[in-house]
């Protein structure tokens, strides 16, 4: 008799197989919080960039990638205090003289209003009400994202 | 009548409220190789170490984390040409001079024999029969993972 | 109880050195930037530098660069002001503060030790 | 540098009097001020950040407002505790973090 986690196991199997989905998030995990199609987690130490960035990736998710000017809002109504400073998966990349998301796409100028440098070694953070460009040497906090809802297609076969 | 995708979820969440897990894969997404408890990506592009470790972020994973000299040789097996080499998620601190892993702990020596230097900006990769420091700016492949089975207790509260 | 102590004040010669030593308590000291602040005899305040929470950065103005040391020990909940080629005017209290958390660089002082005085006379 | 110039120099008040201090960067500074108070032989105490955001446990009487180059502490009923020298400082993330020259609040 197999448990109904087991049971899953072989239901979502057959569900990949048929539709190539990555086995998602159905629930956000404890700690973190529901935005939309998205778990995201606020953390409470600070770090450079870098250190938050590998922070996220061993927590088996991603610095926070912002999709448009309306989800920076949502997400910027979750923090609480008007100075504190998260950083997010975008950095400023010194070859492409752009700001670039850590998925390799590139900021639409239009989605975030920068306040600060684009610069070498610059990265971004927001606030409650503002983008910055801060140093990635910076020590503050940070947002991990993980996707909610399976992603039909999401095969990842290679960047 | 809900689909069994649909009753999977009710009863993973069962699960995950009864024991604090977090909602862990139940099987490896298309492309990802099974070792064990995890699921690997082996990258057939090149990257520096910093991208390396920003791509297996936004694909929510960690670049590879090695537990011991066991683990190791069974990555290695893996790896079909003798040449080549990945990066993992091990690199050099220097306010710490010591190797640390992306998740903050250190290396305990005895675990992997490193070729090369413990030096500012080196980071550390595999080939089939070795494993080596390298210049973090080197483009080479790299090893993302993920976690196969759900971890107990395993909760994120914060880093 | 949260606070600051700072100690290691006293009169010194011009040419001379000091190290002004700042114990915190009642938080997370690893978490903070943290900062040295003085303030001459009936003047106002002046920033001389300050150590990012894991001691990797740090900052110093232009008026003390080069004679003056910030360092911290998280294990002992302590931060620390080297000073050498004291100067007469380097006569001030000096306090330690610490910034608001996450705020990064930018450093707001929410809260200071009571000061301590360095007199640079001959 | 930023300069940063507080103005008046000193003000006599009255209890229940509205004080207002401005405080003058050189160059732009988005939102980035801090109000402090400082009693005789006392550390300063953050009253304001962010420009506007009241520091926990200072009492509402006291407010911050201003963006950009031109800011300003309003204390809307002196109290007879308030009496001190009020000093702004620049945040921007970029040492110096320099203070302005302060502004004495007295007694009338």
């Known amino acids: 008799q197999k448990s109904s986690i087991e049971k899953c196991s072989v239901d979502i199997q057959q569900s990949r197989n048929k539709t190539t989905e990555r086995p998602g998030l159905l629930n956000c995990p404890i700690y973190w919080q529901q935005l939309r199609e998205k778990c995201l987690l606020f953390s409470h130490t600070v770090n450079p960039w870098n250190n938050s960035l590998a922070d996220c990736s061993t927590k088996e998710s991603s610095l926070l990638l912002i999709r448009d000017k309306d989800e920076l809002i949502h997400t910027q109504n979750l923090i609480r205090d008007k100075a504190i400073l998260f950083w997010i998966g975008l950095n400023f990349s010194l070859s492409e003289k752009n700001w670039k998301w850590i998925n390799g796409s590139f900021l639409n100028s239009n989605d975030l209003e920068i306040r600060g440098d684009a610069k070498e070694n610059s990265c971004i953070s927001i606030s409650q009400t503002s983008v910055y460009s801060e140093y990635c040497s910076t020590e503050i906090r940070w947002i991990c994202q993980k996707e909610l809802t399976p992603v039909r297609n999401k095969v990842y076969p290679d960047s | 009548q809900k689909s069994s995708i649909e009753k999977c979820s009710v009863d993973i969440q069962q699960s995950r409220n009864k024991t604090t897990e977090r909602p862990g894969l139940l099987n490896c997404p298309i492309y990802w190789q099974q070792l064990r408890e995890k699921c690997l990506l082996f990258s057939h592009t090149v990257n520096p170490w910093n991208n390396s470790l920003a791509d297996c972020s936004t694909k929510e994973s960690s670049l590879l984390l090695i537990r011991d000299k066991d683990e190791l040789i069974h990555t290695q097996n893996l790896i079909r040409d003798k040449a080549i080499l990945f990066w993992i998620g091990l690199n050099f601190s220097l306010s710490e001079k010591n190797w640390k892993w992306i998740n903050g702990s250190f290396l305990n020596s005895n675990d992997l024999e490193i070729r090369g230097d413990a030096k500012e900006n080196s980071c550390i990769s595999i080939s089939q029969t070795s494993v080596y420091s390298e210049y973090c700016s080197t483009e080479i492949r790299w090893i993302c993972q993920k976690e196969l089975t759900p971890v107990r207790n395993k909760v994120y509260p914060d880093s | 109880q949260v606070q600051l102590v700072e100690s290691g004040g006293g009169l010194v010669k011009p040419g001379g050195s000091l190290r002004l030593s700042c114990a915190a308590s009642g938080f997370t000291f690893g978490q903070y930037y943290m900062s040295w602040i003085r303030q001459a005899p009936g003047k106002g305040l002046e920033w001389v530098s300050y150590i990012s929470p894991s001691g990797a950065t740090i900052a110093y103005a232009d008026s003390v660069k080069g004679r003056f040391t910030i360092s911290r020990d998280n294990a002992k909940n302590s931060l620390y002001l080297q000073m050498n080629s004291l100067r007469a005017e380097d006569t001030a209290v000096y306090y330690c503060a610490r910034s608001l958390m996450s705020t990064g660089t930018h450093l707001y002082f929410d809260l200071w030790g009571r000061g301590t005085l360095v007199t640079v006379s001959s | 540098d930023i300069q940063l110039t507080q103005s008046p120099s000193s003000v006599s008040a009255s209890v229940g009097d509205r004080v207002t201090i401005t405080c003058r960067a050189s160059q732009g500074i988005s939102d980035w001020l801090a109000w402090y108070q400082q009693k005789p032989g006392k550390a300063p105490k953050l009253l304001i950040y962010?420009?506007?955001s009241l520091q926990s446990g200072v009492p509402s009487r006291f407010s911050g407002s201003g963006s950009g180059t031109d800011f300003t502490l309003t204390i809307s009923s002196l109290q007879p505790e308030d009496f001190a020298t009020y000093y702004c400082?620049?945040?921007?993330?970029?040492?110096?973090?320099?203070f302005g020259g302060g502004t004495k609040v007295e007694i009338k």
């Open positions: 962010a420009a506007s």
């Open positions: 400082q620049q945040v921007t993330s970029f040492p110096p973090y320099t």
